[in-house]
């Protein structure tokens, strides 16, 4: 299926930038891995590079405004031609759900006292209004609540006295448009404005005075330009050469608005001064290699020794990483393929342990399934031996840091019947649905 092809992918927003054009295949668009594509206008933007997880979105608002609720965030597998970690296809969303609380308590309504007495009428002649008030204290609201309805009410009152009203002009209305937009036409251009005797109108009984002066005025329009001349396009120029040596590019034709040139504010030529066409070199662009994440550390050993586990003997271990995705003469990965460090092996060593404090509450699992729960733990944490933190293995090479490596066997006193982990679980409340934000825009 044809796609819309773009020259840039903006990592921060996940948006496609720099439209190259439509009607090309994904394979042709992605000859250049810096490009990106959309299956439909306004749809999800996918970069042409190998797939990887986007940044996590911000947490959505808490599902309730008071007491405990839940909130979601997501990230998306973006890229083309491959999978993200977890063997997941591009376009897939991964969700996290956590508990939240915007406000501990929920608002409670209050109740009104009785109405107070009516205040005097607001005017001394004709009709006005009078007001009475009540207090929100029967009982008072709690936790930011309020009383339903209004704290005051008004009603009409009549003094039975007639007021005279003298006329006054309302403000002038706007000047009417000039009777012509440019000078040199058949009629002298004029503009007019008017006003009403309505601010207020004079009363009849008792009689008020009318407004003094005229209700309209007229003047000659000044500063009008000479009448305009519309612009017209010249012919299209030659097509520019394809500007890229690999993937898709864009060629251009140009024309000038000079047949005739617009004059005296006449409109510029309608339409575009340039038009573009996609050109296809059919040559894949170089793809630089990217390091995979580091592998696991190898076991901590010392040459010519069977085992150094549980002993104050420093050893060495290494880990490696793979340079993936390099194609079409792209750059090799910079940096080392192997990492070596010094270590003490505590693999399977019985060590005295102590119970940790409670961990923070974890995420709610499963985030997109029924009855998600969150958990926290206390772990039996090993007390590491007091071996020297640095060693000098070879003369003249200085001190090297030494890291503990391996899974020891910590021993703690039993806690709630457990020897290694004590876990507490709680349900997550008011859980929202995992809904693709791209779908909500459709």
């Amino acid at each position: 299926d044809p796609v819309l092809c773009f020259t840039q992918y903006e990592e921060s927003s996940g948006k496609c930038k720099g439209l190259l054009g439509g009607g090309v295949s994904v394979e042709d668009c992605c000859l250049n891995t810096a490009f990106a594509y959309q299956k439909r206008s306004g749809g999800l933007c996918q970069p042409c590079r190998s797939p990887r997880w986007s940044l996590w979105s911000t947490w959505a608002p808490c599902s309730v405004t008071c007491s405990e609720g839940s909130q979601l965030r997501y990230r998306r597998c973006v890229g083309w031609n491959g999978q993200c970690s977890g063997k997941v296809a591009p376009g897939t969303l991964e969700w996290q759900l956590q508990a939240c609380e915007d406000q501990q308590c929920c608002p409670e309504m209050g109740g009104w006292s009785g109405w107070g007495p009516w205040e005097p009428c607001s005017v001394t002649c004709s009709k006005g209004t009078r007001t009475r008030r009540r207090a929100c204290n029967h009982p008072a609201p709690k936790c930011g609540g309020h009383c339903p309805g209004q704290a005051q009410e008004s009603e009409a009152c009549d003094t039975q006295q007639v007021c005279p009203t003298h006329g006054a002009w309302a403000t002038w209305g706007p000047w009417t448009p000039c009777s012509a937009s440019c000078h040199g036409g058949p009629h002298e251009p004029k503009e007019t404005r008017s006003r009403k005797c309505s601010a207020p109108e004079p009363s009849q009984k008792p009689p008020g005075k009318p407004c003094p002066g005229l209700a309209y005025e007229q003047r000659r329009c000044t500063g009008l330009p000479p009448c305009p001349v519309a612009g017209g396009w010249g012919p299209w120029g030659p097509v520019s050469p394809c500007p890229v040596t690999c993937g898709l590019g864009q060629t251009m034709e140009q024309r000038t608005c000079n047949h005739p040139v617009p004059q005296h504010g006449g409109p510029f030529c309608a339409g575009d001064a340039t038009r573009t066409h996609i050109c296809n070199t059919a040559v894949p662009c170089p793809v630089d290699g990217e390091w995979d994440s580091w592998g696991e550390w190898s076991p901590c050993i010392r040459r010519n020794m069977k085992s150094i586990s549980c002993q104050e003997i420093p050893g060495q271990q290494s880990r490696g990483r793979t340079c993936r995705g390099r194609k079409f003469d792209g750059h090799r990965c910079a940096g080392q393929q192997q990492d070596i460090r010094h270590c003490y092996s505590i693999q399977h060593c019985p060590l005295k342990g102590s119970w940790s404090e409670w961990s923070t509450w974890g995420l709610c699992m499963p985030p997109c399934g029924p009855n998600p729960t969150r958990a926290r733990q206390r772990l039996c944490t090993p007390l590491l031996p007091k071996y020297p933190p640095t060693v000098s293995m070879v003369e003249g090479q200085g001190e090297k840091n030494v890291t503990f490596w391996g899974r020891p066997l910590p021993r703690c006193e039993e806690l709630q019947g457990q020897k290694l982990v004590v876990e507490e679980k709680r349900p997550c409340l008011h859980v929202p649905a995992c809904k693709d934000p791209e779908e909500e825009e459709l």
Partner: nanobody, 129 residues
């Protein structure tokens, strides 16, 4: 363990309708995302339709959009595929699939067969012209 059994397939004329059922035993289907896939002889397995566990989203292949509808009856522990205006190119074995509640979602995720944990044995649909 979830066991899925499809039924409702058969031989129909072009333009006719069929309703496929997928009954589950072992666990309640209401907490699973459910999908229908099909495979014609000599062709790869193809996504047809899917619905998320709360039915907040349903997804369809472009080739069946507007003709097929996926739905579920939690009380009967069954998922359905209502197929209207059938065409000869809809001829295939139809499979029902269930996905354990997970941290993933999205159209592209549910279109992938690898996203599902349990599969039925399939039911044959043949549409003659």
């Amino acid at each position: 363990q979830v066991r899925l059994v499809e039924s409702g397939g058969g031989l129909v004329q072009a333009g006719d309708s069929l309703r496929l059922s997928c009954a589950a035993s072992g666990r309640t289907l209401s907490s699973y995302a459910m999908g229908w896939f099909r495979q014609a002889p000599g062709k790869e397995r193809e996504f047809v339709a899917a619905t998320t566990w709360r039915d907040t989203s349903t997804y369809y292949a472009d080739s069946v959009k507007g003709r097929f509808t996926i739905s579920r009856d939690n009380a009967k522990n069954t998922v359905y595929l209502q197929m209207n205006s059938l065409k000869p190119e809809d001829t295939a074995a139809y499979y029902c699939a269930a996905e354990e509640p997970s941290k993933y979602s999205g159209r592209d995720y549910y279109m992938m067969g690898d996203s599902y944990d349990y599969w039925g044995q399939g039911t044959q649909v043949t549409v003659s012209s």
